[in-house]
Interface confidence: medium
């Protein structure tokens, strides 16, 4: 017969031949003869084959060096490397974890969107008005500003992004003040304390 | 109060080895990693060695590596800086800080020892 | 590693002076960068954090700026207790974790 041009799936061609291709977890020994099957032999310890193959070496597994901050997350099998990840308080520089880098601190006026994890670094947020963050830090969120009223205080120093509001004690001469006419051209108003940190932010 | 009190300073021959503790107080001291601060007489501030707070990740300066081992006994409360193999050039005093986060993230350090001195001459 | 370097590393100032120390940063650091005050036989002691974050207890007189590689620390109004020496830290990479050399602050 016409010897083949091509072979079905999990076979290769030699010599005019269509072999059979070793099993995952196995490596070639010696390929397929007219009246001998392809010979296969188990990868060692330590090694692994991930696919039908007609490799002559196995592949070592991936070694997790705790000097770079690793550790086996997973161990491999005959068909399995090794899967790597970080030590606590680090993350994978790379998808394919090579090595570890620590963590990030969101810095004051940044609070953690998103804690890290063995393979992501901290991920950060801007603290949105009303909330603040005053510290560095790898797991606060933002904190929302005090609320001054129901604690019956007034505000008497705005908050930021960085700072709490400072909350003080009602008080009618300070909570109420008189705009002179200069200050309006001409016209009088009563403005209380509030309408004045909206009008200080705006 | 935190309070941080370092002991184990001393004279040493060229060599020798030598231990330190820092004992900690006013805080909880599993939760945040912990470091070892060294300044040589009329000089400046060098970093020796950091540990984390749970699980107790370790790095060293290159200066000291591999003569120099931090470990952490939290049930105790205490800080430890084992020094072998040491020479002239460690003469300094040893302060142990206390790091702002219990991981290694970039974190400054809040609160410091007293110090204590280690002679390292024959 | 990152290397600090700090400037001048000496300075004499009188009572109420205003005074300025530059750290800058052999790369970016962002705002990581924290400052100490040392007195002689003390222990540092941490002033500000995050380049510009005021510790807790410390004066207002204080005050921290900059971003990416430089960065000052301020002083605004001298006091008697301010004479002493100022560090610099870098805690961008980590570790190891670097000082400045140190900017020493004396009465004139």
């Known amino acids: 017969p016409e010897p083949p041009t091509a072979c079905r799936e999990k076979q290769y061609l030699i010599n005019s031949q269509c072999c059979s291709l070793c099993q995952p977890g196995q490596k070639l020994v010696s390929d397929c003869t007219e009246f001998t099957e392809t010979e296969c032999l188990p990868c060692g310890e330590s090694e692994f084959l991930d696919t039908w193959n007609r490799e002559t070496r196995c592949h070592q597994h991936k070694y997790c060096d705790p000097n770079l901050g690793l550790r086996v997350q997973q161990k491999g099998t005959s068909e399995t490397d090794t899967i790597c990840t970080c030590e606590e308080g680090l993350h994978c520089t790379s998808e394919s974890c090579e090595s570890c880098v620590p963590h990030r601190s969101c810095l004051p006026g940044f609070g953690v969107k998103q804690i890290a994890t063995g393979v992501s670094d901290t991920i950060c947020e801007p603290c949105p008005v009303g909330f603040f963050s005053n510290v560095s830090s790898a797991f606060e969120k933002c904190r929302p500003w005090t609320s001054c009223e129901t604690k019956d205080l007034v505000v008497q120093q705005a908050g930021t992004n960085k700072t709490d509001v400072v909350c003080g004690p009602q008080d009618r001469q300070r909570e109420q003040k008189l705009i002179s006419e200069e200050d309006l051209g001409g016209e009088q108003k009563l403005i209380s304390e509030e309408d004045l940190h909206h009008h200080h932010h705006h | 109060e935190v309070q941080l009190v370092e002991s184990g300073g001393g004279l040493v021959q060229p060599g020798g080895s030598l231990r330190l503790s820092c004992a900690a107080s006013?805080?909880?001291?599993?939760?945040?990693?912990m470091n070892w601060v060294r300044q040589a007489p009329g000089k400046g501030l060098e970093w020796v060695s950091i540990?984390?707070?749970?699980?107790?990740?370790?790095y060293y300066a290159d200066s000291v590596k591999g003569r120099f081992t931090i470990s952490r006994d939290n049930s105790k409360n205490t800080l430890y800086l084992q020094m072998n193999s040491l020479r002239g050039e460690d003469t300094a005093v040893y302060y142990c800080a206390k790091d702002t986060e219990r991981d290694i993230t970039g974190s400054p350090f809040d609160y410091w020892g007293q110090g204590t001195l280690v002679t390292v001459s024959s | 590693d990152i290397q600090m370097t700090q400037s001048p590393s000496s300075l004499s100032a009188s009572v109420g002076d205003r005074v300025t120390i530059t750290c800058r940063a052999s790369?970016?650091?962002?705002?990581?960068l924290n400052w100490y005050q040392q007195k002689p036989g003390k222990a540092p002691k941490l002033l500000i954090y995050a380049a510009s974050s005021l510790q807790s207890g410390v004066p207002s007189r204080f005050s921290g700026s900059g971003s990416g590689t430089d960065f000052t620390l301020t002083i605004s109004s001298l006091q008697p207790e301010d004479f002493a020496t100022y560090y610099c830290?870098?805690?961008?990479?980590?570790?190891?974790?670097?000082f400045g050399q140190g900017t020493r602050l004396e009465i004139k």
């Open positions: 006013g805080f909880t001291f599993s939760s945040y990693a």
């Open positions: 790369q970016s650091i962002s705002s990581y």
């Open positions: 540990i984390s707070g749970t699980i107790g990740k370790t």
């Open positions: 830290q870098q805690s961008y990479s980590t570790p190891p974790i670097t």
